[in-house]
């Protein structure tokens, strides 16, 4: 946030940039939290734009019985590994096809025991305030589907009739990691010493980090004809004086007509 300065007074302004603002030869360059000619004003809204998507990663192990393990499968650049990866990915894409959050699989390790496949199932959802519930539900469906397929697609008489066959007892979910996004925490951190006065409000499922000085939200402070200004003790209304009135009160809602006051004084004189 910048304010340009022209003329002789600029040199004085340079040394007066406040709140960590820096002079660039023309104006005070203000840090994120401040604006104004001298960076003296606190912003009323902070961009905490959430990520467009939130991801989750499930660490799973399955045992593939329809492929005989060979040492080449340990080498991720081998023809054997690449082919296994392709077939396994295709099979998992079929297994998880009904899960909108499913992105794909990533094999981390293949080891002996038929072929034990250590892999990650990758999930992603569009950010909404309910993202945790959405991803929790998706991880449950992943568990159900992999359990089902590894129970149904099994070798019969040492032969597999499916694209891949599995050992029913070899399926394990090791760990589930969900990318954490906490707008309230982000808002508090970015508001720094004003953190107590900034809150998160949602509009169209998007979080906004605002102080009561930001108009149009349920926490917005109505200063009437005055100006809302944030200080370390919280939001305050700076009341204006017009040609005809003085305004006062916590929300500048008390107007005193100047003529009455002047008239009163004049009367005393």
């Amino acid at each position: 946030r910048t304010t340009t300065c022209f003329g002789d007074g600029c040199q004085n302004t340079a040394s007066r940039c406040k709140n960590g603002g820096t002079w660039d030869g023309l104006k005070c360059q203000c840090p994120n939290l401040y604006y104004g000619e001298l960076c003296e004003e606190v912003v009323s809204s902070i961009d905490i734009g959430p990520p467009e998507t939130i991801s989750a990663q499930m660490e799973l192990t399955v045992t593939v019985t329809s492929v005989k393990f060979t040492e080449e499968l340990k080498n991720h650049s081998s023809q054997e590994f690449q082919e296994f990866k392709q077939t396994f990915t295709e099979q998992m894409n079929i297994v998880y096809s009904g899960i909108p959050e499913y992105v794909g699989v990533n094999i981390t390790k293949l080891r002996l025991g038929s072929v034990v496949v250590e892999h990650d199932v990758l999930l992603r959802t569009k950010y909404t305030p309910e993202y945790k519930t959405v991803l929790d539900n998706a991880t449950e469906v992943v568990k159900e589907k992999i359990t089902k397929v590894t129970t149904q697609q099994i070798m019969i008489n040492d032969i597999c009739s499916d694209m891949m066959c599995f050992n029913t007892t070899g399926t394990q979910v090791q760990n589930i990691t969900v990318t954490q996004y906490d707008p309230e925490e982000d808002c508090r951190k970015m508001a720094k010493e004003y953190g107590d006065y900034f809150v998160v409000e949602y509009r169209d499922q998007k979080p906004y980090c605002i102080s009561p000085c930001e108009p149009g939200f349920s926490v917005s402070k109505n200063c009437n004809l005055g100006k809302c200004q944030m200080s370390l003790s919280g939001p305050q209304c700076l009341c204006v004086t017009t040609e005809t009135h003085w305004y006062s009160g916590e929300t500048c809602n008390q107007g005193t007509q100047k003529s009455l006051v002047y008239g009163h004084h004049h009367h005393h004189h």
């Epitope: 329809s66 492929v67 060979t70 023809q79 077939t87 009739s161 066959c165």
Partner: nanobody, 124 residues
Framework: EVQLVESGGGVVQPGGSLRLSCAAS????????MAWFRQAPGKEREVVAF????????YYADSVKGRFTISHDNSKNTLYLQMNSLRAEDTAVYYC?????????????????WGQGTMVTVSS
């Protein structure tokens, strides 16, 4: 990239014999799986037989057991299918398939590499 070229198809009378060949190229290892599948008009592709080139395993579909023999010549990288006592129901396009893995599945979707097919017609 693995490439497969079949040959040996043709017209034969019931009870007759044919030998199909499939030349493979592009393998980095001498241990892999090869198979013969077939597809009759209007039917799904089905396995006939498969073999591991290290000699570790062979498999035959019940319908061809005792009549067909699958083999592999490592020095020539060639797969064979010796078909004896042929029947009318053996009429189909025969495909050679391969995998760099030691597969134990008869599902065609598990086999990534395919030849163009050779026609076998058993008719009197």
């Amino acid at each position: 990239e693995v490439q497969l070229v079949e040959s040996g198809g043709g017209v034969v009378q019931p009870g007759g014999s044919l030998r199909l060949s499939c030349a493979a190229s592009g393998y980095t290892s001498n241990r892999y799986s090869m198979a013969w599948f077939r597809q009759a008009p209007g039917k799904e592709r089905e396995v006939v037989a498969f073999i591991w080139t290290d000699g570790g395993r062979t498999y035959y579909a019940d319908s061809v057991k005792g009549r067909f023999t699958i083999s592999h010549d490592n020095s020539k990288n060639t797969l064979y299918l010796q078909m004896n006592s042929l029947r009318a129901e053996d009429t189909a396009v025969y495909y050679c398939a391969a995998s760099s893995l030691l597969l134990q599945t008869i599902n065609p979707r598990a086999w990534p590499y395919w030849g163009q097919g050779t026609m076998v017609t058993v008719s009197s």
